[in-house]
């Protein structure tokens, strides 16, 4: 382990679509990947009118996105379908949203996601 | 072992459209990007966009802006790319490749434009 | 997103070492660790060999080393082989925030 960063292993996972796709609905996931890169975890859900829809989480390969972010933040304003990954195990339990916004200030929202 | 394998070759009159598939297997599909790059005969690898499975989020590269539209489809592992209006310079092999850091490729697509 | 210059070819003999530049822009090459290099050989797909500067592929031999000063990139073979031979490209990271660009291809010829 490099000093100072957060090794992933694990990961929550969830699949909304758990039927169509023929996996689990929920549990942890453990993360696989070749043995020098980086693994991360994800979580990606939807705003509908308010309210939170959880799309999937799990496991998410070496991406320089996700580096150093112990937290699972997306900052793209206003996405479609939301989309945040972070280091460390089970580092996508809780995510949010912070928009990252030239003029006005940012606003936090941040989910604890309850899975149906 | 992950593998990425492709549709087979295509021919397309000038003004249509092609679509090509990148069917991935041996590593959870959701867990990474889908790129796609072409190459014409002789020449370089070209970036064309790329796609996050899991929230179907996309980036194109300006040359294919409008002209390019990649989709993937969780239940099949499997990643498309359609560009349309097609041209003759549009003669090439097209590669889908995983990750940010294009670590697996498949084994391309020669996609002919001609009338 | 213009592309990456690299040379067009480069030699060497066998036994010996080449290095391959790739020079970009600081929001390419000079930004963060992005750079990848490629090698391809006639009629096969490209193979990743060195991604985010350095870090050397699994199963890619050590002889092949990255590195990167200011916005140029570089690729190091040494101890060259016959089976070295091939197209090399350098490519950056894409994905999420980040778009792909290449350079244009260096060829490079053991003598």
């Known amino acids: 382990a490099i000093l100072g960063r957060s090794e992933t292993q694990e990961c929550l996972f969830f699949n909304a679509n758990w039927e169509r796709d023929r996996t689990n609905q929920t549990g942890v996931e453990p993360c696989y990947g070749d043995k020098d890169k980086r693994r991360h975890c994800f979580a990606t859900w939807k705003n509908i009118s308010g309210s939170i829809e959880i799309v999937k989480q799990g496991c998410w390969l070496d991406d320089i996105n996700c580096y150093d972010r112990t937290d699972c933040i997306e900052k793209k304003d206003s996405p479609e379908v939301y989309f945040c990954c972070c280091e460390g195990n089970m580092c996508n339990e809780k995510f949010s949203y912070f928009p990252e916004m030239e003029v006005t200030q940012p606003t936090s929202n941040p989910v604890t996601p309850k899975p149906p | 072992q992950v593998q990425l394998v492709q549709s087979g070759a295509e021919v397309r009159k000038p003004g249509s459209s092609v679509k090509v598939s990148c069917k991935a297997s041996?590593?959870?599909?959701?867990?990474?990007?889908i790129n796609w790059v072409r190459q014409a005969p002789g020449q370089g690898l070209e970036w064309m966009g790329t796609?996050?499975?899991?929230?179907?989020?996309?980036s194109y590269a300006q040359k294919f802006q409008g002209r390019v539209t990649i989709t993937a489809d969780t239940s099949t592992s499997t990643a498309y790319m359609e560009l349309s209006s097609l041209r003759s310079e549009d003669t090439a092999v097209y590669y889908c490749?995983?990750?940010?850091?294009?670590?697996?490729w498949g084994q391309g697509t020669l996609v002919t434009v001609s009338s | 997103q213009s592309a990456l210059t690299q040379p067009r070819s480069v030699s060497g003999s066998p036994g010996q070492s080449v290095t391959i530049s790739c020079t970009g822009t600081?929001?390419?090459?000079?930004?963060?660790?992005?750079v990848n290099w490629y090698q391809q050989h006639p009629g096969k797909a490209p193979k990743l060999m060195i991604y985010?500067?350095?870090k050397r592929e699994s199963g890619v031999p050590d002889r092949f080393s990255g590195s990167k000063s200011g916005n140029t990139a570089s690729l190091t073979i040494s101890g060259l082989q016959a089976e070295d031979e091939a197209d090399y490209y350098c490519?950056?990271?894409?994905?999420?925030?980040?778009?792909?660009?290449f350079g244009g291809g260096t060829k490079l010829t053991v003598l």
């Open positions: 985010g500067v350095s």
């Open positions: 796609i996050n499975p899991v929230s179907g989020s996309t």
């Open positions: 490749a995983r990750g940010g850091w294009f670590d697996y």
């Open positions: 600081s929001s390419d090459v000079g930004s963060y660790n992005r």
């Open positions: 490519g950056t990271f894409a994905g999420g925030r980040y778009y792909g660009v």
């Open positions: 041996g590593y959870t599909f959701t867990s990474s990007y």
